[in-house]
């Protein structure tokens, strides 16, 4: 009678096992083992027992011990069960972002692993079991559906295999897939609100604000603001479920015309976009042109106002005739025109909005000098020892230089407070001089002595 020990073995794939073949007869003609596995006989004294080392066991096998005794041939099988954990435990790839309210199908694939009767596949959210099924098929596939909730945000979904060999006196072998971290989101159906100037002048800055409510998680929302091809760099402030993105926009002559302002909000794998048109315009201030900015009294002066070809101008409140981008007026320069402002106002319509620009120029009229009785009296009579201020104002543009001299040397202190003495008496020649010429005027100072009172 042939016997085998052990009769049943569970061993790791690629492992080795010692199998003892024994026979009950003392002098067997033959005692051996039949197996396709690599084998070594571990020698023992005696004829009725042989020990074999079977190695590199890759799959379940049934080596057979045999013996040939005088009373006949007999055999005994040992059952080798190979165990190995799966080579692949994988969750089917999914977009990491999932909208709240969507049904999400988790699919776990398991390749390999044995014995399959002891292999279970478990789908988990964190440590919570969602589904548990035996591994069936190659690859084994287990699926479950999850309704995505807001509180699933950041949850880790995974797939675990359990090779339970505890009934065989071994342990529970677990393999876990790489986790799938779910990012849930809510992006409202309403487009973002975009507040910006409808028109924007070249070489100026404007402010654009884009905002949206009802987002989750708001901190993950990406905001893209652009004017044409120009990406704007907004400062984003977040509320509980809202954001406001504020950006400065600068435009140049190259941007002139109608441009598209875009605000796109991207959350998860969805986006909402708002478009608005902004008209970029160039409108220089009107040009006020004087024949000459500085003219002599009596000169004919032409004042012209020129503006943007589509603008309408008024010059000193008088609309151009006909209404258009140019206006002019003619005048003969008088001293009263010196310092006179000529103001041109231009109005341009851009995208239904009226834009106003002004420009002012001042006319300088050169005249004089002038010395007249009103401003430079010809005769003064002052009591001796009294405090007086001699006054003589010369007029003209440029302002003339004024000197009053007695006998060509003694000056009259114009505009200064003086004590009247006998020396002050006499006739002074006041001379006003400027680039425009020279005028003179005699001024007499009389001093009243106390003895004549």
């Amino acid at each position: 009678q042939t016997s085998v020990s052990p009769s049943k073995v569970i061993l790791p794939r690629g492992g080795s096992v010692l199998v003892t073949c024994s026979t009950s007869c003392d002098q067997p003609k033959l005692l051996g083992i039949e197996t396709p596995l690599p084998k070594k006989e571990l020698l023992l004294p005696g004829n009725n027992r042989k020990v074999y080392e079977l190695s590199n066991v890759q799959e379940d096998s049934q080596p057979m011990c045999y013996s040939n005794c005088p009373d006949g041939q007999s055999t005994a099988k040992t059952f080798l069960t190979v165990y190995w954990t799966p080579e692949r435990v994988e969750l089917a790839p999914l977009p990491s972002w999932q909208p709240v309210g969507k049904n999400l199908t988790l699919r776990c694939q398991v390749e390999g692993g044995a014995p399959r009767a002891n292999l279970t596949v478990v789908l988990l959210r964190g440590e919570k079991e969602l589904k548990r099924e035996p591994a069936v098929g190659e690859p084994a596939e287990v699926t479950t559906t999850v309704l995505v909730r807001r509180d699933h945000h950041g949850a880790n979904f995974s797939c675990r295999t359990e090779l339970d060999l505890r009934p065989q006196g071994l342990e529970l072998f677990e393999n876990t897939s790489a986790p799938y971290q779910l990012q849930t989101f809510v992006l409202p159906a309403t487009p973002p609100q975009l507040v910006s100037p409808r028109v924007l002048e070249v070489d100026t800055q404007g402010t654009v604000v884009c905002s949206l409510d009802g987002l989750f998680p708001v901190s993950e929302a990406q905001v893209h603001l652009a004017l044409g091809d120009q990406r704007l760099n907004p400062t984003v402030t977040y509320g509980n479920d809202s954001f406001s993105a504020k950006a400065s926009v600068s435009v140049t002559a190259e941007d002139e015309g109608t441009q598209r302002l875009t605000c796109a909000v991207i959350l998860g794998n969805q986006s909402q976009e708002t478009l608005q048109t902004v008209t970029i315009y160039s409108f220089p201030a009107p040009n006020v042109i004087l024949t000459k900015p500085e003219v002599s009294e009596g000169t004919e002066v032409t004042v012209k106002c020129e503006a943007h070809p589509r603008a309408k101008v008024t010059l000193n409140g008088v609309p151009a005739q006909p209404l258009g981008p140019r206006a002019q007026l003619l005048l003969k320069a008088t001293p009263e025109d010196n310092g006179r402002s000529f103001s041109c106002s231009a109005t341009l319509e851009v995208a239904g909005q009226l834009i106003h620009k002004n420009q002012t120029r001042e006319l300088r009229v050169l005249y004089g000098p002038r010395l007249d009785e009103r401003d430079c009296p010809g005769n003064w009579t002052w009591p001796e020892n009294s405090q007086q201020t001699p006054m003589c104002q010369a007029w003209g543009n440029p302002l003339p230089e004024l000197k009053c001299l007695k006998d060509g040397t003694f000056p009259l202190p114009i505009g200064e407070s003086v004590t009247v003495t006998r020396d002050l008496e006499g006739t002074y020649l006041c001379r006003a001089r400027s680039t425009q010429g020279e005028v003179t005027r005699k001024v007499t100072v009389n001093v009243l002595s106390p003895r004549y009172e």
């Epitope: 070594k40 571990l42 023992l44």
Partner: antibody, heavy 116, light 107 residues
Framework: EVQLVESGGGLVQPGGSLRLSCAAS????????IHWVRQAPGKGLEWVAR????????IYADSVKGRFTISSDDSKNTAYLQMNSLRAEDTAVYYC?????????WGQGTLVTVSS | DIQMTQSPSSLSASVGDRVTITCRAS??????LHWYQQKPGKAPKLLIY???QSISGVPSRFSGSGSGTDFTLTISSLQPEDFATYYC?????????FGQGTKVEIK
Amino acid sequence: EVQLVESGGGLVQPGGSLRLSCAASGFNIKDTYIHWVRQAPGKGLEWVARIDPANDNTIYADSVKGRFTISSDDSKNTAYLQMNSLRAEDTAVYYCTASGYWFAYWGQGTLVTVSS
Amino acid sequence: DIQMTQSPSSLSASVGDRVTITCRASQSISNNLHWYQQKPGKAPKLLIYHASQSISGVPSRFSGSGSGTDFTLTISSLQPEDFATYYCQQSNSWPYTFGQGTKVEIK
């Protein structure tokens, strides 16, 4: 009947070499493992090396690694232990043994003396 | 390396005595423990393999037990031919190692 016979021992100077042979009969060495075990005079047993004659896989004790080489010749059903760079502490009776894990069959042993 | 420690190192006993020799491993070696008997000038002889498995031709008074780290060789009734040195050996991991031996002498 299983039999193992060692030969090749003798007196050798430190730094010298010796080659021990182990002739097997009664079994095919390819079907099992061959080991060398030594015993210094008056001391205990020390495992030295193992060969799997079927594929020439070898394993050595740290004390002899790099100096001793175990080999086999299937056609002669013989195993060998080439000993180089011998030291005084290698002085021992060298046994070849057959089987694996345990040592069921032993040769009579051959004495190696390393001395100047 | 796994250290094997035998105790006692030597013992004196009389014919008919029950003799127990212990062997302790420095770490668990399951049942990968074998016992040998060596007489002066002779090669060792295998007595027990795998801690407790008997060998054909070895008298039944020799038995082994133990698992893990602690093992015992028992000679139930000592006979005159049993006076020798006994060694344990582990085959759990390389290098294989022997105990230092226990010498059984006549009292």
